[in-house]
């Protein structure tokens, strides 16, 4: 004969565990039903009655099968430097990610707690590694024969124009100035822009250190105080 299917609540056999989507209630000493995502336990089970579930209220959620007495609060609204990539529903928390031109300077389990603008490389420096959703731009000094005259998070160092006759030699932050005869270039003229990064889920990678001659252009240092706790409002 097939084994009888037990309906919740039921007392488990000694040494056995409750089934999937059930939990063992210590008070009732019974296997009881969990609540589905989007719900929470309104009334816990007893020896004779199963868990009573209720829907999560607005701005609260449960993502997993559970027996929590209250749903979790959705995170605060996304700030102006963020975009909401997942709305707060009864079954999922709100997820905020950084808007274009910004990156995540302080991450949390899902999404981002704090966005900061991508580093801008100043004149004489160009982008060595473009920023991503989770990592800042890395700047490098323009090598001899190249320059950048912009403060930008996308411009790389460009070659100096090659003059038949040089009026003013170029340097790291200025292009060469030619006399009236037509110059030639080893690259197409105009600022070279790196594309803004598309949304990625890549892990934060350590940038290669800049040469010692290049000052750090990061807004951001070595061990100390930690960020405020989520939802903290201070003393």
């Amino acid at each position: 004969l097939p084994a009888q299917v037990a309906f919740t609540p039921y007392a488990p056999e000694p040494g056995s565990t409750c089934r999937l989507r059930e939990y063992y209630d210590q008070t009732a000493q019974m296997c009881c039903s969990k609540c589905s995502p989007g719900q929470h336990a309104k009334v816990f089970c007893t020896k004779t009655s199963d868990t009573v579930c209720d829907s999560c209220e607005d701005s609260t959620y449960t993502q997993l099968w559970n027996w929590v007495p209250e749903c979790l609060s959705c995170g605060s609204r996304c700030s102006s430097d963020q975009v909401e990539t997942q709305a707060c529903t009864r079954e999922q928390n709100r997820i905020c990610t950084c808007r274009p031109g910004w990156y995540c300077a302080l991450s949390k389990q899902e999404g981002c707690r704090l966005c900061a603008p991508l580093r801008k490389c100043r004149p004489g420096f160009g982008v060595a590694r473009p920023g991503t959703e989770t990592s800042d731009v890395v700047c490098k000094p323009c090598a001899p024969g190249t320059f950048s005259n912009t403060t930008s998070s996308t411009d790389i160092c460009r070659p100096h124009q090659i003059c038949n006759v040089v009026a003013i030699p170029g340097n790291a932050s200025m292009d060469a100035v030619c006399t009236s005869t037509s110059p030639t270039r080893s690259m197409a003229p105009g600022a070279v822009h790196l594309p803004q990064p598309v949304s990625t889920r890549s892990q934060h990678t350590q940038p290669t250190p800049e040469p010692s001659t290049a000052p750090s252009t990061s807004f951001l240092l070595p061990m100390g105080p930690s960020p405020p706790a989520e939802g903290s409002t201070g003393d």
Epitope: A105, L106, P215, S216, T217, S218, F219, L221, P227
Partner: nanobody, 117 residues
Framework: DVQLVESGGGLVQPGGSLRLSCGGS????????MSWVRQAPGKGLEWVSG????????DYADSVKGRFTISRDDAKNTVYLQMNSLKSEDTALYYC??????????WGQGTQVTVSS
């Protein structure tokens, strides 16, 4: 150990001014960029302003542009935030923060700014 200590917060009327200071110790202050970040009551963290290590580039959130000015004095290991034309929406706990490789990992305890009439 790295330490960041903010001061200068307080109660001010709308339209008024305050100057926040953040002193750093335990690291080579002049080698690092610094940021100001705020948290309004019941809201998330908001990046406010930043300054590069040599002071050559400063940047501001749109909400404070033209009203706030960030500066630094490496001789005093201090970064400042001059806040003018304050509005009620500037009420928040203001943190000084910094970090390596673009991560804001190191924070002060914060200084409270309340804008109210």
């Amino acid at each position: 150990d790295v330490q960041l200590v903010e001061s200068g917060g307080g109660l001010v009327q709308p339209g008024g001014s305050l100057r926040l200071s953040c002193g750093g110790s335990g690291f080579t202050f002049s080698s690092y960029g610094m940021s100001w970040v705020r948290q309004a009551p019941g809201k998330g963290l908001e990046w406010v302003s930043g300054i590069y290590d040599d002071g050559s580039v400063t940047d501001y959130a749109d909400s404070v542009k033209g009203r706030f000015t960030i500066s630094r004095d490496d001789a005093k290991n201090t970064v400042y935030l001059q806040m003018n034309s304050l509005k009620s929406e500037d009420t928040a706990l203001y943190y000084c923060a910094t970090g390596e490789d673009g991560e804001l990992n190191y924070w002060g305890q914060g200084t409270q700014v309340t804008v109210s009439s």
